[in-house]
Interface confidence: medium
Amino acid sequence: MAFSGSQAPYLSPAVPFSGTIQGGLQDGLQITVNGTVLSSSGTRFAVNFQTGFSGNDIAFHFNPRFEDGGYVVCNTRQNGSWGPEERKTHMPFQKGMPFDLCFLVQSSDFKVMVNGILFVQYFHRVPFHRVDTISVNGSVQLSYISFQNPRTVPVQPAFSTVPFSQPVCFPPRPRGRRQKPPGVWPANPAPITQTVIHTVQSAPGQMFSTPAIPPMMYPHPAYPMPFITTILGGLYPSKSILLSGTVLPSAQRFHINLCSGNHIAFHLNPRFDENAVVRNTQIDNSWGSEERSLPRKMPFVRGQSFSVWILCEAHCLKVAVDGQHLFEYYHRLRNLPTINRLEVGGDIQLTHVQT
């Protein structure tokens, strides 16, 4: 994953999890915990910022509880003793649903954002610079824990109002139906569409169901290449497509195509032999003009995992790689609902596709 200028993320860590925060907590450090609340077992989970691995000294204990209508407990533990609880009688998490939890360390407090919305602030009871470990336990599955210190500014910063540097490799959970957000899109309503998550068996017992089709089973943790699938309902403003995979060590090129009949409405073509990310449209077997400009260095690296997030807007596609916005591609084929086929090919191994 392309997490520039910060500690490398912990990817898909097993729970319970404890990991070192390199350099400890610093003013301005943002830590993102991305995962899914388990729907079956347990009624609690916790994220702890602590000293060492014992759990006796926890500067900040963030503890959502699905009990008594749901609430979140914040507390501090010193020498094994808990202080007075601070309770927030609001539950921003839902069982079985993914979440993105972002902590901002500041001189006076921790600020906590859940799913892009500021949720709570917790004033320091002990000096935060003592913290060198983050731990997560309880009924939660983790996708990643990432770190970003704004003092090391990447060329193209991801964002600061929401959790950033996220690889967007969500656990493949059913999302159900969704609608466009109000106020943002043009007046014509987007269709209500089912998300389809194409899954593979990555480990015993880790198969998830999808709301629209049964899981696609393969004998090894990879998709067949080239991979072709239908985008139910085609594209429309607010439609998003997520792909994750790994670039082969000797990769030359790969492509992600969004197709409309015989046309390729959007051709995304990372080329390692040219150190470029080429975008184009093919209509009646004729290619248009290439777009190659990037706001930062080539985000795809041979031998490394990646995620690509394509968001359809009214005028363009927005593409993020490893959670950071990379470019916009203005629609050349404007009949969005007819763009209903995804094709992936080339020198990569796919691990997750969500259309």
């Epitope: 600020k111 954002m113 892009g116 704004p150 910063p157 109002t161 929401v162 969704r178 943002v184 927005k318």
Partner: antibody, heavy 129, light 107 residues
């Protein structure tokens, strides 16, 4: 149709208090973020305070911190700005405004807009002796 | 706090001109940058959100872009109704800051 209507402005002496109201229609304040933005005569826009109603989180500009309080009454679908210890430099037109709706979680690389799509007509607050 | 330095503070242009207004953030910010148009005695109107997304109903002659900490509003062909004051705005962890404004006047 989304509408925001401010009220409660007027003339007040330095050190005095005022409570501004913002009646919302066409959406629910309980699921939106509400901002107060002010504009002194002939000057630019200045953010004052915000309430993230879904969580109750509030934030304030340094210039008003400790003097102003933002709140919302979901039963009345109304947001408020309680202004205490008013100063001459607080004289301005005060706008109540709604944040653009967030994308849900699945669009976060672009997800939190922090932009204001609907504004009230404004209410003038004059602090003068 | 993050400051947004907007330039120029004013400019004179003619109908049909291409106009560019820039805001520079004092530190790394997200793409949660918006642009507004305000006319005298009126509330501001949202033009661009998320740095480059055109808000519903806004003419396509308005566009936004970013390069690092620089954010740009471009009016490709100035129309009579575009003479107004323009503001950029960023949002970071619940704190909002506006640029000082750019007044676009008729040449």
């Amino acid at each position: 149709e989304v509408q925001l209507v401010e009220s409660g402005g007027g003339l007040v002496q330095p050190g005095g208090s005022l409570r501004l109201s913002c009646a919302a229609s066409g959406f629910t304040v309980s699921s939106s973020s509400i901002h107060w933005v002010r504009q002194a005569p002939g000057k630019g826009l200045e953010w004052v305070a915000s309430i993230y109603s879904s969580s109750g989180y509030t934030s304030y500009a340094d210039s008003v911190k400790g003097r102003f309080t933002i709140s919302a009454d979901t039963s009345k679908n109304t947001a408020y700005l309680q202004m205490n210890s008013l100063r001459a430099e607080d004289t301005a037109v005060y706008y109540c405004a709604r944040n653009v709706e967030n994308y849900p979680y699945w669009a976060w690389p672009w997800g939190y807009y922090g932009a204001i799509d609907y504004w009230g007509q404004g209410t003038l607050v004059t602090v003068s002796s | 706090d993050i400051q947004m330095t907007q330039s120029p503070s004013s400019l004179s242009a003619s109908v049909g001109d291409r106009v560019t207004i820039t805001c520079r953030a004092s530190q790394s910010v997200s793409s949660a940058v918006a642009w507004y148009q305000q006319k005298p005695g009126k509330a501001p109107k949202l033009l661009i959100y998320s740095a480059s997304s055109l808000y519903s109903g806004v003419p396509s002659r308005f566009s936004g872009s970013r390069s690092g900490t620089d954010f740009t509003l471009t009016i490709s062909s100035l129309q009579p109704e575009d003479f107004a004051t323009y503001y950029c705005q960023q949002s970071s962890w619940g704190l909002i800051t506006f640029g000082q404004g750019t007044k676009v006047e008729i040449k």
